[in-house]
């Protein structure tokens, strides 16, 4: 049976086997087409989600679709039901928390009272000014908290207590990529991890340990990527994996926060990378132990220079490393998080590509997660 499962796939009605390599090849080899059913699926970028959260104390903003203008939500008459609606619009199913935070004098957007219409937040027509003088600070999910804070050093062995959202994504029990837990159902990783194997069956996720071989595997229900853009072949290197059963959170299994839409990280901002990837370029071996390293944001202009990536780094990517080189992500770290700590940990990047590992002029290139928030929310909403 093991041999059969490894090399063949069973079609139904009539029952017969087809070679496993014919799974997800774009051809319907089973009469009912089930060989093309459990495959990596692409999902379009979709419409603008009309709510978003700002890095200014996670304050809620609402889009006026008529004008295309964004407004900050005033706390006046804001309810739990409105908080749930806002979070559902972003695809969250968990119970949100919210509180009032004072409007600051540097508040840029206009402030409006919020109401609900057809399960979407709307600006209340002809409401008064914001009497409370407060905005809505909204958290759709408790995230980004770990039991242990890492020390700021070069490269060192990591503990799952520091990075409880880190997962190993494995094909046929072999570690292929890293990933991050976003909520009980979803793991964030890189799309290029699935280029070779587009069938969902043999992909597994392992969470809750910093040792590669030592933790139970979780079944995957769906793998979703963005439609390929031939104009920018390296763009859209992002994937969401839906788990068959929701995770139970613990000290060693927790979600990381998505970044805020306006999370603009300036050059030299300290960030962290983690992974089980190769310890040397073009060789060495996969690390059995999770490794962590502190890096920093590298200016895109510098990253696109003639002695570096020569314009290949787009606005949907970011660069990170250390200016003198030597600390970088490598093969096998792909899909893992590039992390920033404010009040919580945020996944600001996904390990994507680079030339070599740890070169001074060619730092790691990461998918900029904030550029894909809309896509993530649309995927989640479609799967609610």
């Amino acid at each position: 049976k093991v041999i059969l499962d490894k090399y063949y796939f069973l079609c139904g009605q009539p029952l017969h086997f087809i070679p496993r390599k014919q799974l997800c090849d774009g051809e319907l080899d089973c009469p009912l087409g089930e060989d093309e059913e459990h495959c990596v699926k692409s999902f379009p970028e979709g419409p603008a989600v009309a709510v978003r959260l700002s890095k200014d104390r996670s304050t809620l903003q609402v889009l006026d679709s008529a004008t295309g203008n964004w407004f900050s939500a005033c706390f006046d008459n804001f309810t739990e039901a409105l908080a749930e609606t806002a979070c559902r619009q972003m695809g969250y199913s968990s119970k949100p928390t919210f509180r009032a935070v004072e409007i600051g004098p540097d508040q840029d957007l206009d402030v409006v009272e919020i109401t609900e219409n057809s399960q979407e937040l709307r600006m209340r027509n002809s409401s008064g000014p914001c009497l409370s003088g407060s905005l809505v600070s909204l958290h759709c999910l408790a995230c980004g908290k770990s039991l242990k804070t890492p020390r700021v050093v070069g490269v060192e062995e990591a503990s799952v207590d520091s990075w409880p959202w880190q997962v190993s994504i494995q094909y046929d029990k072999q570690h292929v990529c890293g990933g991050s837990i976003l909520d009980p159902h979803w793991v964030l990783t890189a799309a290029h991890c699935f280029r070779k194997h587009t069938d969902v069956f043999n992909w597994k996720v392992r969470a809750g340990s910093d040792k590669l071989g030592s933790f139970p595997s979780l079944a995957v229900a769906k793998i979703i990527i963005i439609e390929f853009n031939p104009m920018y072949p390296k763009d859209n290197d992002i994937a969401l994996m839906k788990l068959q059963f929701p995770l139970t959170f613990s000290g060693t299994v927790r979600p990381i926060c998505l970044p805020f839409f306006d999370e603009e990280l300036t050059p030299a901002t300290p960030l962290w990378i983690i992974g089980w990837g190769f310890t040397k370029q073009n060789g060495g071996k996969m690390s059995d132990i999770l490794l962590q390293a502190s890096v920093q944001v590298i200016d895109s202009t510098r990253c696109n220079a003639d002695d570096a990536y020569q314009g290949e780094v787009t606005e949907k990517m970011m660069c990170a490393g250390i200016p003198e080189g030597g600390v970088d992500t490598c093969q096998g770290d792909s899909g893992g998080p590039l992390m920033y700590q404010s009040d919580q940990w945020h996944v600001v990047g996904i390990v994507s590509w680079g030339y070599g590992c740890g070169g001074p002029s060619t730092p790691g290139v990461y998918t900029k997660v904030s550029a894909y928030l809309n896509w993530i929310y649309n995927v989640w909403k479609a799967e609610l």
Epitope: P105, V112, S126, S127, G128, P129, C130, G133
Partner: antibody, heavy 121, light 107 residues
């Protein structure tokens, strides 16, 4: 675009009252606080008070308490500032001003053209 | 009431000069401070809010800084249209008081 158009110049006798109007257009009238500021000839700006056009609530600087009344008419999107017991030192240009965002402590961004009130016997 | 003072009360400068005006509050007002420009016979115009945020449409030669009690308005390179009177205003507590103004005229 946002516009605040004020009533014309007034000449009043000491002890009389004056009522200055300010008609708003180009935005949702009830969503923004309105403030009143005055400026005596050759002098600086003096803040008088605020009004919430939605509720009609007001707040006045202590100096004007008991003499000033701010009202509004939502049907015409107009706010009014009435100053009573006029004295010669009330001679000034009176401005209505709408706050930048819908929050009281936001500074005024849009201003009326000003109304000159002259108090003279 | 919070008292606002400005210095200098007037200054003479030439086109291209860097001009700095200071504003002091009698007690801490965080960054609840705005700067206005007023020309004779005209209503004031908002330049800066929240001590350092440039109002949309205002030239970038204007900048503001400070927090607490001491604030500064800087015009990096004075232009002919900048000759006017400048006022600071606090909106930290009612009444929202103005400074006495600084008149900038041509040297």
């Amino acid at each position: 675009q946002v516009q605040l158009v004020q009533s014309g110049a007034e000449v009043k006798k000491p002890g009389a009252s004056v009522k200055v109007s300010c008609k708003a257009s180009g935005y949702t009238f009830t969503s923004y606080y309105m403030q009143w500021v005055r400026q005596a000839p050759g002098q600086g700006l003096e803040w008088m008070g605020w009004m919430n056009p939605n509720s009609g609530n007001t707040g006045y600087a202590q100096k004007f308490q008991g003499r000033v009344t701010m009202t509004r008419d939502t049907s015409t999107s107009t706010v009014y500032m009435e100053l009573s017991s006029l004295r010669s030192e009330d001679t000034a240009v009176y401005y209505c001003a709408r706050v930048r965002i819908g929050w009281l402590q936001s500074p005024p961004l849009y201003w009326g053209q000003g109304t000159l009130v002259t108090v003279s016997s | 009431d919070i008292q606002m003072t400005q210095s200098p009360s007037s200054l003479s400068a030439s086109v291209g000069d860097r001009v700095t005006i200071t504003c002091r509050a009698s007690q801490g007002i965080s960054n609840y401070l705005a700067w206005y420009q007023q020309k004779p016979g005209k209503a004031p115009k908002l330049l800066i809010y929240a001590a350092s945020s440039l109002q949309s449409g205002v030239p970038s030669r204007f900048s503001g800084s400070g927090s607490g009690t001491d604030f500064t308005l800087t015009i990096s390179s004075l232009q002919p249209e900048d000759f006017a009177t400048y006022y600071c205003q606090q909106s930290y507590s009612i009444p929202f008081t103005f400074g006495p103004g600084t008149k900038v005229d041509i040297k």
